[in-house]
């Protein structure tokens, strides 16, 4: 038994960020005369939260009217709670002293824990595009959550990934925490439409996890396959050679026709057709005037895709002594080669 006891009935209080925290405190006596003060933390570095005697504390309101006679309820409310408000709060009775007030009795303290939602996960992929069969890393970050316990999962097109590493910082006590995770993903040619999803579950989200996504379309590069073919004669002395550029992504592509190594024409892919898997096809043709050539012609379709080194495919066009007799089999020998 004591002359005066300061009672803080709640050992801990859990409040969501943005809400109001109620910290309860009652005294068993009003004697001796002196103010109640609230502090966060203990010892010389403690932070004054409220002083009944004096001061301006805009975020703090008293639960009851402290100017009312015989009031022994010194509970306070703190508005707009943030993770930075977490800590142990002490209700302390002071007694009038000469010249200064003297700490008389302290409550046992109430630990305020702040539940703060994690920020929306941000997923980022590699700086440079990569081709199928390569492994790329994706990172996911979310910040500002409390308490520390959190669950992070990775998915690719709804399938959970297992090859990832996750860290929650800091390791020790903090007002709020951050999570950082790196997942490894093996690219396939079908990944243009694929999504990588980072899913974060936290107590503050009430079973409705937050998701961050990255489209593999921003990461993948599917190099084209080339096929050069000779079409039937359109008119006498003319041969139509086509270059089929298939299954490439992204669309950025430049094609150059070479006749015996000399640039004949350069064009940029424009009216492409899109495949179901999100890759593109494009076709370019070259009309060759056979009569203009005395010797065989080596036609090369050279493609520069997405800033990568050019790939090419060649087609040999045989020129005979009697062009007028040339039919649709002018290039009876069609030797193709991939040159890089």
């Amino acid at each position: 038994e004591e002359e005066l006891q300061v009672i803080q009935p709640d050992k801990s209080v859990l409040v969501a960020a943005g809400e109001t925290a109620t910290l309860r405190c009652t005294a068993t006596s009003l004697i001796p005369v002196g103010p109640i003060q609230w502090f966060r933390g203990a010892g010389p570095g403690r932070e004054l939260i409220y002083n009944q005697k004096e001061g301006h504390f805009p975020r703090v309101t008293t639960v009851s009217d402290l100017t009312k006679r015989n009031n022994m309820d010194f509970s306070i409310r703190i508005g707009n709670i943030t993770p930075a408000d977490a800590g142990t709060y002490y209700c302390v009775k002071f007694r009038k002293g000469s010249p200064d007030d003297v700490e008389f009795k302290s409550g046992a303290g109430t630990e305020l824990s702040v539940r703060a939602k994690p920020s929306a996960p941000v997923v980022s992929g590699p700086a440079a595009r990569a081709t199928p069969q390569h492994t790329v890393s994706f990172t996911c970050e979310s910040h500002g959550f409390s308490p520390r316990d959190i669950t992070l999962k990775w998915f690719k097109n709804g399938n959970e990934l297992s090859d990832f590493q996750t860290n929650v910082d800091p390791v020790g006590e903090s007002v709020s925490y951050s999570i950082h995770s790196t997942a490894k993903v093996v690219l396939t040619r079908e990944d243009v439409h694929s999504q990588v999803i980072c899913e974060v579950a936290h107590v503050t989200l009430q079973g409705d996890p937050l998701r961050g996504t990255a489209n593999l379309s921003e990461t993948i590069r599917v190099p084209p396959t080339l096929e050069v073919t000779q079409q039937p004669v359109r008119a006498e002395n003319q041969v139509n050679v086509t270059c089929q550029v298939r299954k490439f992504y992204p669309q950025r592509l430049q094609l150059t026709w070479l006749e015996n190594g000399n640039v004949s024409r350069t064009e940029t892919a424009s009216t492409v057709t899109e495949n179901k898997d999100g890759t593109y096809n494009w076709m370019s043709w070259l009309l060759v005037n056979v009569s203009a050539h005395r010797d065989d012609v080596k036609l090369t379709c050279q493609v520069e895709h997405d800033g990568q080194p050019a790939v090419s495919k060649s087609h040999d066009l045989k020129v005979s002594a009697h062009p007028k007799e040339q039919g649709s089999n002018t290039a009876a020998e069609n030797t193709g080669s991939n040159e890089r």
């Epitope: 004591e2 005369v33 002196g34 100017t67 006679r69 015989n70 009031n71 009038k96 008389f104």
Partner: antibody, heavy 114, light 111 residues
Amino acid sequence: QVQLQESGPGLVKPSQTLSLTCTVSGFSLTGYGVNWIRQPPGKGLEWIGIIWGDGSTDYNSALKSRVTISVDTSKNQVFLKLSSVTAADTAVYYCARAGKMDYWGQGTTVTVSS
Amino acid sequence: DIVLTQSPASLAVSPGQRATITCRASESVDSYGNSFMHWYQQKPGQPPKLLIYLASNLESGVPARFSGSGSRTDFTLTINPVEANDAANYYCQQNNEYPWTFGGGTKVEIK
């Protein structure tokens, strides 16, 4: 139950130091303060000072230079020392519990005389 | 120092009547919404006994015939109805400011 009992010499010579003891029971001296109050014959009450549960003290400024209040919590005793006494210090001396003064001892009479 | 002036100095009351004692402080004894004024009864050869604390609160075990009121500088102790064993000296006391002080006392006699 709560009890306080003052004890000490009934007669003190002028200029000497008056020493009194208040022995308490039924409460803890670490939880409650103890006051000393005196009452000259046929007169009113005068507060001398208090020792709080943490051992800190507050004294009547009129007597401060001559008064010392101390405590021995292990013996449940509070002590009053009043130095350089004169006949004006003749009084019944009481100890009383806490700021509320809800329990008093019976008092002990101290006469200052040569 | 806060000086407490009690009036009257003495008072004779018949049993069953009302006795009113006033205590005026030289400055306010109010702090933090409360009046740190208390009332004691002292009978001859006995220590004072707490009757009322914080101006108006009846101490445990004290008959409800005793009541206190007032704030800041003006306080009243009322005994209604007075009984024969209420004959005693009555003191007001403040512990709002050091040094704590007592009033000079009011002697209540029963007619």
